[in-house]
Interface confidence: low
């Protein structure tokens, strides 16, 4: 038994949900679905476990409802990543993942999906109503990102209603070629949602067919910077206490993205789309939660008194982050 | 630069409770990091006990998780680490050591202290 | 737990030499895995990052390399001040767990 939560609503209902006649009026709005999201407008759902067994463990799921090739994704907490939200997972499809506290296991599922445990033991563990976003970038769709959390009173054992609607981000560049006909659908869709508003919100149980294990490999970047993903965000608050997070800062991307696909270049140029950040062509992989994100060379220094991280002979570095000066 | 300094009772009595702390100099204990406790046993292998976050959220290995209390003592900008029901397997080096950005490896240690477990 | 086995437990070499430890995980760790140096009666040293980053201030004759499950630790030329246990470490899944180490001696 165990309480969940899951985000977007927009699923496939499960067989059994809903009464016939029910299920026949949402043949078409899932029809229209399926046309927006295999014509650009990609959507990210995002499932969020509370074991019954181990109230302290949580379980993340996210997939990508996408035609596009899925690059990197990013699963934090507290809010978005980039708004205030501590990154607990990276996970590459190629380069492999990693991973930061109180994260315990970071997996693929399938091509387009992945979980992630959290481990914690009383004080270790999130708060029942912690915001758990994941954020994929893709080509060609960009950057989606959808967040979830547990209802504060979830009971352990009992399933909760899942979470009505998605917070979604999306890069505008995602949408471009978007037919008239098919944003009319979309709207028509989302027409329809809302007149069954006040029916329990289909779930769906995503795939766990041909879970594929990413293929971790040593990986040397290119020297070169490049473009960084950038989104703009908004925040999202958690009714979290402050002490019970892990505070964390906007940053930058892990140093996997000094390197992007040959096909980065083609990728459509939208507003806030894709900014020029340097990234460091070579360096650490700089935890999320601390803020400070190198954009060239080995290691931040930190602001702290007296404490310098390896002292770097090519001089200081400009940096992202409240603690450090961009 | 940030220095770990580990400190306590050289020799403790089966069945009793071991207590360490760990003095942290050059960096506010309470502003970040993960702070961890590690153990040598003597011509041995390195044993991560567990830690405590900045935040106070800590994580323990499961094989002591039963004997370990890990606290922060923030005006004294000391962490401490609390092993009852000792042995003679509990004798050891044991360290504090800081983990930076976390996943990022142990880079700052103490100098380690032994703790002799005999009646 | 994730076991972490190193290989050899012990080596004996001769300054100059090029030396090679190894270490395997018991599960997948990815890149998530450090080498220490430690020399008695001293606490250990992180020697190399992610399985392969270096870290400034470590001569860059220690080399890391490897992924997933294999690793390697590569010691290009021995140096007296080498001659210590190397320790790998993974920070992937706690509990966080260490190899059994690797003795290094003057032949």
């Known amino acids: 038994m165990r309480t969940e939560a899951q985000v977007p609503a927009l699923q496939p209902p499960e067989p059994g949900l809903e009464g016939a006649m029910g299920h026949r009026t949402l043949v078409l709005p899932w029809v229209l679905l399926t046309l927006c999201v295999t014509a650009g407008t990609p959507e990210v759902w995002v499932q969020v476990r509370m074991e019954a067994t181990e109230l302290s463990s949580f379980t993340i799921r996210c997939g990508f409802l996408g035609s596009g090739s899925i690059s990197l994704v990013t699963v934090s907490w507290g809010g978005p990543n980039g708004a205030g939200g501590t990154t607990l997972a990276v996970l590459h499809p190629e380069r492999g993942i990693r991973q930061w506290a109180p994260a315990r296991q970071a997996r693929w599922e399938t091509q387009s999906s992945i979980s992630l445990i959290l481990e914690g033991s009383g004080a270790s563990s999130p708060c029942a109503n912690t915001t758990f976003c994941c954020k994929f970038a893709s080509f060609p769709e960009g950057s989606w990102e959808a967040c979830g959390s547990l209802p504060p009173s979830s009971d352990p054992g009992l399933s909760a209603p899942p979470t009505p609607a998605p917070i979604l981000r999306a890069d505008l560049a995602g949408i471009l070629g978007v037919s008239g006909v098919l944003l009319f659908g979309c709207v028509y869709l989302l027409h329809l949602l809302r007149r069954h508003k006040h029916r329990p919100a289909p779930r769906l149980q995503p795939s766990r067919t041909s879970p594929q294990a990413p293929r971790a490999r040593a990986w040397a970047p290119s020297q070169a910077s490049q473009a960084a993903l950038h989104v703009p965000y908004a925040t999202i608050n958690t009714s979290c206490r402050p002490a019970t997070l892990d505070t964390a800062h906007p940053h930058g991307g892990p140093s996997w993205w000094a390197s992007l696909p040959t096909h980065a270049a083609h990728r459509p140029q939208g507003p806030a789309a894709w900014a020029s950040t340097p990234i460091p062509a070579r360096g650490s992989f700089v935890s999320v939660e601390n803020g400070l994100y190198a954009q060239a060379g080995e290691r931040p220094p930190h602001t702290g008194p007296g404490l310098t991280l390896f002292p770097d002979p090519r001089g200081p570095r400009a940096m992202e982050g409240p603690l450090g000066v961009r | 630069q940030v220095q770990l300094q580990e400190s306590g009772p050289g020799l403790v009595k089966p069945s009793e409770t071991l207590s360490l702390t760990c003095t942290v100099s050059?960096?506010?204990?309470?502003?970040?990091?993960?702070w961890n406790w590690i153990r040598q046993p003597p011509g041995k292998g390195l044993e991560w006990i567990g830690y405590?976050?900045?935040?106070?959220?800590?994580n323990y290995n499961p094989s002591l998780k039963s004997r370990v209390t890990i606290s922060v003592d923030t005006s004294k900008n000391q962490f401490s680490l609390k092993l009852s029901s000792v042995t003679a397997a509990d004798t050891a080096v044991y360290y504090c050591?800081?983990?930076?950005?976390?996943?990022?490896?142990?880079?700052?240690w103490g100098q380690g202290t032994t703790v002799t477990v005999s009646s | 737990d994730i076991q972490m086995t190193q290989s050899p437990s012990s080596l004996s070499a001769s300054v100059g030499d090029r030396v090679t430890i190894t270490c395997r995980a018991s599960?997948?760790?990815?890149?998530?895995l450090h080498w220490y140096q430690q020399k008695p009666g001293k606490a250990p040293k992180l020697l190399i990052k992610?399985?392969?980053d270096s870290i400034s201030g470590v001569p860059s004759r220690f080399s890391g390399s490897g992924s997933g499950t294999d690793f390697t630790l590569t010691i290009s030329s021995l140096q007296p001040e080498d001659f210590a246990t190397y320790y790998c470490?993974?920070?992937?899944?706690?509990?966080?767990?260490f190899g059994g180490g690797t003795k290094l001696e003057i032949k």
């Open positions: 050591a800081i983990i930076y950005y976390d996943y990022d490896g142990f880079v700052y």
């Open positions: 050059g960096y506010s204990i309470s502003s970040d990091y993960a």
């Open positions: 405590i976050r900045y935040n106070g959220n800590t």
């Open positions: 599960q997948n760790v990815y890149e998530n």
């Open positions: 992610f399985a392969s």
């Open positions: 470490l993974q920070l992937y899944s706690t509990p966080y767990t």
